[in-house]
């Protein structure tokens, strides 16, 4: 079942899954200037058997401007960059990430994604905090969130932790370095 | 292994109270509900009522308002379970129960304790 | 509050055969989300209820496929196909759709 609302928000913090559990959707969303395929899906849903999870469907993005093509445009240098990025810190993300029984791993990019994803969680799947550059993380527990239910009420966790002052992002779980993104990893974890 | 450990048997008078404990082994109460359920000898089950040990966020069946109190103490692991001013309808098997994370239902139970309420 | 009237009381079988039992709602059990919270449950002799078939039709990890529950609105039905040894005991049905949630008075399960 998918969990009612967002996992918490926590000043100057980001937070990931490890992996995603059967029945999550990813909303296929474009950046500015780009829509979804016309024959496209509107998500990826992590789907499986007992052996092997993986997404179904895939997102792709095409111009705005172009009509009835899936012709995609060349990024300019500023997006290559920014695309560059993205695509390392889901590599990273990849590595770090062990296989889960009825799970799927953060699925890659796809040309022209808006920067934001947005996830659709289910119940029993388990976020990960850790502060944005610049902030520490003070602990008092598990920077973890979990969405829970008892009989259709759903409610994630709060995590503990305190984002403060000025130093290194921590780290989310199997992580060795902390990231070298500007914002944190990821830039862009959401849920519906 | 997930597993609840209950409190021993009581044997109370009426017009007390008593306080039956229910500690978990194996995943963290915070992570679930942990409800209590009623069992009268002989005689079927009553949902009394449940305790977010995450956040201390109680519901319970109206019957059991103003008798019965869930508390939780997340770092021992442990929910409790007050019951007051205690009358021989008291006496019975308690449960208590904790919904599996991912299906939200009752999945795991504690052995439970028997309260005598007696003269 | 919702009631749980399960039928029969008692329900003497020969192992091998197959055994049903009924449970009607006062009220439709479906949630505000849509899902039917509906359980059954089976407390053997001396222990602790166990879960055997949540939300009306799926059964539980490691439940036997000789399970099953069917179902819709305010009637439901636990099937058992070939009655084992091991299946005796007092089976509850139990709404978890509307606070309080509840139990059906249970129905006994014993060998003819």
């Known amino acids: 079942e998918l969990c009612d609302d967002d996992p918490p928000k926590i000043t100057h913090a980001t937070f990931k899954a490890v992996a995603y559990k059967e029945g999550t959707m990813l909303n296929c969303e474009c950046k500015r200037g780009f829509r979804r395929i016309k024959s496209g899906s509107p998500y990826m849903l992590c789907t499986g058997n007992s052996s092997h999870s993986s997404w179904d469907n895939q997102c792709q993005c095409t111009s705005s401007a172009a009509r009835n093509t899936t012709k995609q445009v060349t990024p300019q240098p500023e997006e290559q960059k920014e695309r560059k990025t993205t695509e390392m810190q889901s590599q990273m993300q990849l590595a770090d990430q062990v296989s889960l029984p009825g799970h799927c791993r953060e699925p890659p990019p796809w040309e022209n994604e808006a920067t934001e994803r947005i996830y659709h969680f289910v119940v029993g799947q388990t976020v990960y905090y850790q502060c944005v550059q610049g902030y520490r993380a003070l602990h008092r527990g598990p920077a973890e969130s979990v969405c829970k239910m008892t009989h259709g009420k759903t409610r994630w966790t709060q995590p503990q932790l305190i984002c403060t002052g000025e130093t290194e992002p921590s780290q989310f779980p199997g992580e060795e370095e902390p990231q070298a993104s500007p914002d944190g990893l990821p830039e862009s974890e959401t849920s519906r | 292994e997930v597993q609840l450990q209950q409190s021993g048997a009581e044997l109370v008078r009426p017009g007390a109270s008593v306080k039956l404990s229910c500690t978990a082994s194996?995943?963290?109460?915070?992570?679930?509900?942990v409800h209590w359920v009623k069992q009268r000898p002989e005689q079927g089950l009553e949902w009394i009522g449940y305790i977010d040990p995450d956040n201390g966020d109680t519901e319970y069946a109206s019957k059991f308002l103003g008798k019965a109190t869930i508390t939780a103490d997340t770092s021992s692991n442990t929910a409790y379970l007050q019951l007051s001013s205690l009358t021989s309808e008291g006496t019975a098997v308690y449960y208590c129960?904790?919904?599996?994370?991912?299906?939200?239902?009752?999945?795991?139970w504690g052995l439970g304790t028997l309260v005598t309420v007696s003269a | 509050d919702v009631l749980m009237t399960q039928t029969p009381l008692s329900l003497p079988v020969s192992l091998g055969d197959q055994a049903s039992i009924s449970c009607r709602s006062s009220?439709?059990?479906?949630?505000?989300?849509?899902?039917?919270?509906l359980e059954w449950y089976l407390q053997k002799p001396g222990q602790s209820p166990k879960l055997l078939i949540y939300k009306v039709s799926n059964r539980f990890s490691g439940v036997p496929d000789r399970f099953s529950g069917s179902g819709s609105g305010t009637d439901f039905t636990l099937k058992i196909s070939r009655v084992e040894a091991e299946d005796l005991g007092v089976y509850y049905c139990f709404q978890g759709s509307h606070v309080p949630w509840t139990f059906g008075g249970g129905t006994k399960l014993e060998i003819k």
């Open positions: 009220q439709s059990i479906v949630h505000s989300n849509g899902n039917t919270y």
């Open positions: 129960t904790t919904d599996d994370t991912s299906y939200g239902m009752f999945a795991c």
């Open positions: 194996g995943f963290n109460i915070k992570n679930d509900y």
